[in-house]
């Protein structure tokens, strides 16, 4: 599941602040790309990396889920 995959990625990041960056990245935002969202982060490159990684993975998983839904339909 999406939640499980994000938790796996977040587990790589030891610092609680950086973990939160990952979870923030995984949140849904259909208006902007992951890159555009990450550009706003003022907590530095470690946070941006975690945010981006989790955002990209979450976006891909969501896209796969909706693609499967369309195939079933």
């Amino acid at each position: 599941t999406l939640q499980k995959k994000i938790e796996e990625i977040a587990a790589k990041y030891k610092h609680s602040v950086v973990k939160k960056c990952c979870y923030d990245g995984a949140c849904v935002n259909n208006d902007e790309t992951c890159e555009q969202r990450a550009a706003r982060i003022s907590l530095g490159p470690r946070c941006i990396k975690a945010f981006t990684e989790c955002c990209v993975v979450a976006s891909q998983l969501r896209a796969n889920i909706s693609h499967k839904d369309m195939q079933l339909g």
Partner: antibody, heavy 115, light 108 residues
């Protein structure tokens, strides 16, 4: 220590183009850092032009500067560039690069457009 | 785009005085994405306060920031001569990123 070193002042004619450089040192340029560009007209406030993400080359522009500014990077020299084209007197300003995203600023490049 | 209006445009204070400047947004801004910069004459801007209330490295503790939604402020508890500068707020809550018009702080 992070440092952003910008190119020197430019005096250019109306209608011409100019390319400003911003050389980064003190951090891995190709890491998760964005490079933003900001315009400051004389005695005025700051205006965001756009950013480039050196890692991927991805850009995002303020709509107001689309067609005016083009942002590029040369990863091998850790340098970001901004080209400004079809210059008019309205483009006379100090231009800054800023990274981290805005924790580090270059010293600014003065561009003067005059016949 | 989100318009940031700073007030007052110019303010004057004596050393030791407490000063507050405000930044109002035309629509709601996330507190994580509201920052303040200090710019002295002829110099580049410096990140001064990030995410509404966090002081950037090297910023004296007499500075503080607060606010939420559409109203934010920067306060100096006891102004010193070296604080003379223009202070800009900036939002990164939505694109395009925008700056306020600035508040110029003069010391008597």
């Amino acid at each position: 220590e992070v440092r952003l070193q910008q190119s020197g002042p430019e005096l250019v004619k109306p209608g011409a183009s100019v390319r400003i450089s911003c050389k980064a040192s003190g951090y891995t340029f190709n890491d998760y850092y964005y490079m933003n560009w900001v315009k400051q007209s004389h005695g005025k406030s700051l205006e965001w032009i756009g950013y480039i993400f050196p890692k991927t080359g991805g850009t995002h522009y303020n709509q107001r500067f689309k067609g005016k500014a083009t942002l590029t990077v040369d990863k091998s020299s850790s340098t970001a560039y901004m080209e400004l084209r079809s210059l008019t007197s309205e483009d006379s300003a100090v231009y800054y690069c800023a990274s981290g995203p805005f924790a580090y600023w270059g010293q600014g490049t003065l561009v003067t457009v005059s016949a | 785009e989100i318009v940031l209006t700073q007030s007052p445009a110019i303010m004057s204070a004596s050393p030791g005085e407490k000063v507050t400047m405000t930044c109002r947004a035309s629509s709601s801004v996330s507190s994580s994405y509201l920052h303040w910069y200090q710019q002295k004459s002829g110099a580049s801007p410096k990140l001064w306060i990030y995410s509404t209330s966090n002081l950037a490295s090297g910023v004296p503790a007499r500075f503080s920031g607060s606010g939420s939604g559409t109203s934010y402020s920067l306060t100096i508890s006891s102004v010193e001569a070296e604080d003379a500068a223009t202070y800009y707020c900036q939002q990164y809550s939505g694109y395009p990123l925008t700056f306020g018009g600035g508040t110029k702080l003069e010391i008597k």
